[in-house]
Amino acid sequence: LLVSQGVLLKCQKGSCSNATQYEDTGDLKVNNGTRRNISNKDLCASRSADQTVLCQSEWLKYQGKCYWFSNEMKSWSDSYVYCLERKSHLLIIHDQLEMAFIQKNLRQLNYVWIGLNFTSLKMTWTWVDGSPIDSKIFFIKGPAKENSCAAIKESKIFSETCSSVFKWICQY
């Protein structure tokens, strides 16, 4: 899946939600390269070269993907289901540029759930698409044990108890 340059879209506040989204100024540029593949079930739009991704109202666009930032708080599993219900998934972060985009749009200092949890079956941190975390790019602060889920805060990833309630980010 090639990283597309795409125009960043300002998503307006919709009538169905209290969530407020922010416009990205477009100063984050990505180098041409290859991203880790995401399973087909997680791809919500036809992504052929002649079709630029356009996000729904309330969703922010960045590098060919759409992001939704919650205003309320849920446990990791409830956040996971919330995203699934909208045919999206909890945030999968591919690189530090994407992390910078996320942090810029969070505009707050609290923990936020992402799509990463510690699976006792594999005994490793795994993204919700089944791929392992790249330890060369990301370091997770805190215990790697059962019932540990990942949250971001100030561009760092922390291990937290999955039953804790935080805001979350959906992505498609």
Epitope: N18, N40, K41, C44, V53, C55, Q56, E85, R86
Partner: antibody
């Protein structure tokens, strides 16, 4: 496949419960089961949906909130409870299943059941 | 709720001709739009999803296009069997999801 049951003639201000039954699959998974109605000679009108996954979340069209309730009663049964019915609720009621894939599409429909008020 | 506005309400064309149906969403729905065909006495049949992806078994004469708020369904090389009512359906990924339909377009084939 899906099939709707319970369509009937009902008096104004009356109530009615419709049932949607699945064959060949159960209502558990990452998809929505929805109700859609069609008044005689008119277009399709979305009523609401229930999520087949563990959350059992529901959502409704603005006009349907309060009078219509969707619930999952068994692993293969979803119901639509309708109250305070009026003549404008006369319609064929369809249940439909959203696909479990990453796309929004109702790819399985029941034949419909007629409600006359 | 998102409102889907479909035009025209009715269109007539000859066998072998082409018709285009438009659908407009009241706010951006990305590419989350489906098209259905319905014949009298039958439930709707899915034709296109993801704005432009043809459902399995649907002839390539049916073509969907558009994104954001503006969408079209084009039926080319019209056949008598295409006489039906066509509906667009948007999907809203907001905190309160909804799946509204357009008002429908009756296609009459001469």
């Amino acid at each position: 496949s899906l099939e709707e049951y319970g369509g009937d003639v009902v008096q104004p201000e009356g109530s009615l419960t419709l049932t949607c039954t699945a064959s060949g699959f159960s209502f558990s998974g990452n998809y929505w089961i929805c109700w859609v109605r069609q008044a005689p000679g008119k277009g399709l009108e979305w009523i609401g949906c229930i999520y087949a996954g563990s959350s059992g979340s529901t959502c409704y069209a603005t006009w349907a909130k309060g009078r219509f309730t969707i619930s999952k009663t068994l692993s293969t049964t979803v119901t639509l409870q309708m109250t305070s019915l009026t003549a404008t609720d006369t319609a064929t009621y369809f249940c439909a299943r959203d696909t479990g894939s990453g796309y929004w599409k109702y790819n399985i429909w029941g034949p419909g059941t007629l409600v006359t008020v | 709720d998102i409102v889907m506005t479909q035009t025209p309400a009715s269109v007539e064309a000859a066998v072998g001709g082409t018709v285009t149906i438009k659908c407009q969403a009241s706010q951006s729905i990305g590419r989350d739009l489906a098209w259905y065909q319905q014949k009298p006495g039958q439930p709707p049949k899915l034709l296109i999803y993801g704005a432009s992806i043809l459902e399995s078994g649907v002839p390539s004469r049916f073509k969907g296009n558009g994104s954001g708020t503006q969408f079209t369904l084009t039926i080319s090389d019209l056949e008598c069997a295409d006489a039906a009512t066509y509906y667009c359906q948007g999907a809203d990924r907001s905190s309160t999801p909804s799946w509204p339909f357009g008002g429908g377009t009756e296609v009459v084939v001469k």
